[in-house]
Structure formats: C-alpha cells, structure tokens
C-alpha cells in the first residue's frame, strides 16, 4: 500500500500580485492559465514560468511548474497553461512505468541477439534473437508492469497489487 503514491501539497505561494489579470469565473470555474480567488469572485492568472493550470478549474492556487532534473533536457518551458516538458538526455531513457529517473541505455545486445531498435528518450535499445526474432528487453518486468490493468482492459472490480 505505502508504495502507491506520496502526494505533496502545493508549495506555499503568495497571494496574487495586484498587477495579475483578473476575470470572472464561469459557473464557478476558471479557464486554463488561471485559478479562482478565495472568495470565488475572480479568476487570477497564473504566473508565467512559475505556475500553471491546464484545464478549467476551481483551484485556489495554480500548480507549481516542474523543474527538469539533472540528466534531463527541457523540451519546452512552463507556460501559464502547460507544464514544463522534460526529456532524458541522449543515451538515457525513462520508461512510462518508472518515471522517477532517466536510466542509461544498454550499449549492446546480449550474445546471439541483434539490435532492431535504438536508444530513445523513452526506451532502451531493442534486441531480438537472431533465429526466432523474439524480443528481449534484457530486464525482468517490474511488479507494477505485470499487474496494472491497462485502460482498455479494466478488471472487474479492479484488483491490483500495490
């Protein structure tokens, strides 16, 4: 259970500066790039490069922009409506199921195998057996990969190992 998630609260932020743009909420919600004021009367714009919101919302604060880690490159900066996009540096990759860090790509395939896929920021090199052509990732699947129901095939009821 404890491995599921640890969710941090938003960083403490100052109240909106007077120069920030304000508009009125629509049906109690503010548009992307804004958050709602505490009294619910105003939509206050997020601060470019500091925080953002991507959808209509009733958030009291915009969300903090992600800072790319060392070992990552910034593909696109944080705007008021979109978080920073970070990508692993060349020669490293991040799998969808283990997003915490970039891992080094393997330099070659095991004996008896040939490389059919290059190292990309989101995948290791891909190797197949010379004879059979079956794929080999070179790694034992992580527990989560084996138990997480894919969006297309939810269990009924969903029962998964944490």
């Amino acid at each position: 259970e404890s491995a599921l998630i640890t969710q941090q609260d938003l960083a403490p932020q100052q109240r909106a500066a007077p120069q920030q743009k304000r508009s009125s909420p629509s049906e109690g919600l503010c548009p992307p790039g804004h958050h709602i004021s505490e009294d619910g009367r105003d939509c206050i714009s997020c601060k470019y490069g500091q925080d953002y919101s991507t959808h209509w919302n009733d958030l009291l604060f915009c969300l903090r922009c992600t800072r790319c880690d060392s070992g990552e490159v910034e593909l696109s900066p944080c705007t008021t409506t979109r978080n920073t996009v970070c990508q692993c540096e060349e020669g490293t990759f991040r799998e969808e199921d283990s997003p915490e860090m970039c891992r080094k790509c393997r330099t070659g395939c095991p004996r008896g195998m040939v490389k059919v896929g290059d190292c990309t920021p989101w995948s290791d090199i891909e190797c197949v057996h010379k004879e059979s052509g079956t794929k080999h990732s070179g790694e034992v699947p992580a527990v989560e990969e084996t138990v997480t129901s894919s969006p297309g095939t939810p269990a009924s009821p969903c029962s998964l190992s944490g």
Partner: nanobody, 126 residues
Amino acid sequence: QVQLVQSGGGLVQAGGSLTLSCAASVSTFGTSPVGWFRQAPGKEREFVSAIRWDGVGAYYADSVRGRFKNSKDNAKRTAYLQMNRLKPEDTAVYYCALPRRGDSELPSTVKEYGYWGQGTQVTVSS
C-alpha cells in the same frame, strides 16, 4: 491490494442527474489525487475530471464544466462525481482512477494513472 469499487451508474433522461461513487481500499487514498475518465463505444478513454489529494480544487474537461462536480471524502476513502444536466453525449462507461505515482500534482492523462475502477455504465436517453 489496491481496489477501487465503483457504483452509481444507470439510465437517466437528458437533463437529469446521477452521482458516481468510487470507494478505495488503500490507506494512501488520503494523499492521492483522484481522476475520472469516460469511454464511449468505439472511442478512446477521455479525461473528465481530477481532484486534488485534499479535495480542495479540481480540473474539469471543457465538455463537462459547470455540469459535473468532483469531490472527495478522505475519511471515507471515497470519491464522488456528481453529474447534473446530463446530455446524450455523456453516455459512456465512467472510470475512477488513482495515479501510479505522485510525480504530478493533478494528473489529467490516462498514462499517468495506474489503478482503475471496474467502470460503471452511464446512459443518457433523449
């Protein structure tokens, strides 16, 4: 084990209301955002709403804004999606979900979620 058990779907006339529930077995529910998605026949699963871990503030898809309300009771380990002024185009299977990890404060894409409810059918007749 992480279990998300959904209830509250059904058949409703256009303009009507329904409330979906999502009960979680996991103690970390109280520190996790909760997302709601829906999938209509022949279409991809789409984002509906996501609520902050503390229940204070949520995201809503443009198509449901002003009509749907996401809420969360951490003491009961249950999330709710209140759906008002329903339209025929809201007809879909609705899923609640917990993120696979805490690297996003308010995830809004399918790939950021790893734990899914069983889904509940919502049918809106005209």
